[in-house]
């Protein structure tokens, strides 16, 4: 069985301010078990944007039904985009671990650029 890969097919996405950004991400396998998380930026200072496991992320919706047992689409939509949302977004697969889940594979990232509203 081939090892799971995280695919972010879009290197960049351009969205007008006030619109909704769609950030695409798929996994190539259901195993190992563990959640998907989305981050803006990389490294220790990265910002958590969405956690499949828990948390309240009012601006974020998932494109697919993540309660499907065979779901491998972890794409998200972020509403009401502002220039402050610009950055590179990473879709990261974790595998279960104790006491904490362990980062397993990351997508290559999608750069979100925000076009200002015409005045």
């Amino acid at each position: 069985e081939e090892e799971l890969q995280v695919i972010q097919p879009d290197k960049s996405v351009l969205v007008a301010a006030g619109e909704t950004a769609t950030l695409r991400c798929t996994a190539t396998s259901l195993i190992p078990v563990g959640p998907i998380q989305w981050f803006r930026g990389a490294g220790p200072g990265r910002e958590l944007i969405y956690n499949q496991k828990e948390g309240h992320f009012p601006r974020v919706t998932t494109v697919s039904d993540l309660t499907k047992r065979n779901n491998m689409d972890f794409s998200i939509r972020i509403g009401n985009i502002t220039p402050a949302d610009a950055g590179t977004y990473y879709c990261v697969k974790f595998r279960k671990g104790s006491p904490d889940d362990v980062e397993f594979k990351s997508g290559a990232g999608t750069e979100l650029s925000v076009r200002a509203k015409p005045s």
């Epitope: 993540l66 309660t67 279960k96």
Partner: antibody
């Protein structure tokens, strides 16, 4: 407070049918996967069927082709249609809310189904 | 028949430590939970995701995993802990939820 209340159990003859309901409250029903789990008298737990928030369905081998799980998100209600019942289906049937990774964090009190002639 | 294996019974004295094991699922494709069931009552989740404790469950309940075996540990067992304990899993490779046969915990 999360509440799950099952109904629809009773006595049915072999070969008969029954529909169970589970009324959910205290959480966003439409966002959660749900399952039915049963327990024969004096026996252990057996997973029966599960359904995603978008109504994709999954079944245990012992009920495949005979039972149908469904949901009505507008009514916050989970259903289990049981056909071609046999004595082996006699059990308390629980509805359970699923966690993000398909374990069961809340259970109803159960409804007893007895298949007997 | 049960896909997960756990001992049928465990006996301990009050204040002692009870350990109940469960095995049978591949680590990479399984999540485990433990459910407590008292006579005439519905099951209650006491451990989920192998080793996480839900809010409201006493700290004396803990879970651990090693390879294909998970263990429920009850430290300082109390009389009220006497119950049946079921190991339950989610198997991502088959989309099913197997259970163990249950372990009757007796507090002597």
């Amino acid at each position: 407070e999360v509440q799950l209340v099952e109904s629809g159990g009773g006595v049915v003859q072999p070969g008969g049918s029954l529909r169970l309901s589970c009324a959910a409250s205290g959480f966003t029903f439409s966002s959660n996967a749900m399952s039915w789990v049963r327990q024969a008298p004096g026996k252990g737990l057996e997973w029966v069927a599960g359904i995603s928030s978008g109504s994709d369905t999954y079944y245990g081998d012992s009920v495949k082709g005979r039972f149908t799980i469904s949901r009505d998100n507008s009514k916050n209600t989970l259903y289990l249609q049981m056909n071609s019942l046999t004595a082996e289906d006699t059990a308390v049937y629980y509805c359970a809310r699923e966690t993000w990774n398909h374990l069961f964090d809340y259970w109803g009190q159960g409804t007893l189904v007895t298949v007997s002639s | 028949s049960y896909e997960l294996t756990q001992p049928p019974s465990v006996s301990v004295s009050p204040g002692q430590t009870a350990r109940i094991t469960c095995s049978g699922g591949a680590y990479s494709s399984y999540y485990y939970a433990w459910y407590q069931q008292k006579p005439g009552q519905a099951p209650v989740l006491v451990i989920y995701s192998d080793d996480k404790r839900p809010s409201g469950i006493p700290e004396r309940f803990s879970g651990s995993s090693s390879g294909t075996t998970v263990t429920l540990t009850i430290s300082g067992v109390q009389a009220e802990d006497e119950a049946d304990y079921y190991c339950g899993g989610y198997d991502q490779s088959s989309y099913t939820n197997p259970f163990g046969g249950g372990t009757k915990l007796t507090v002597l």
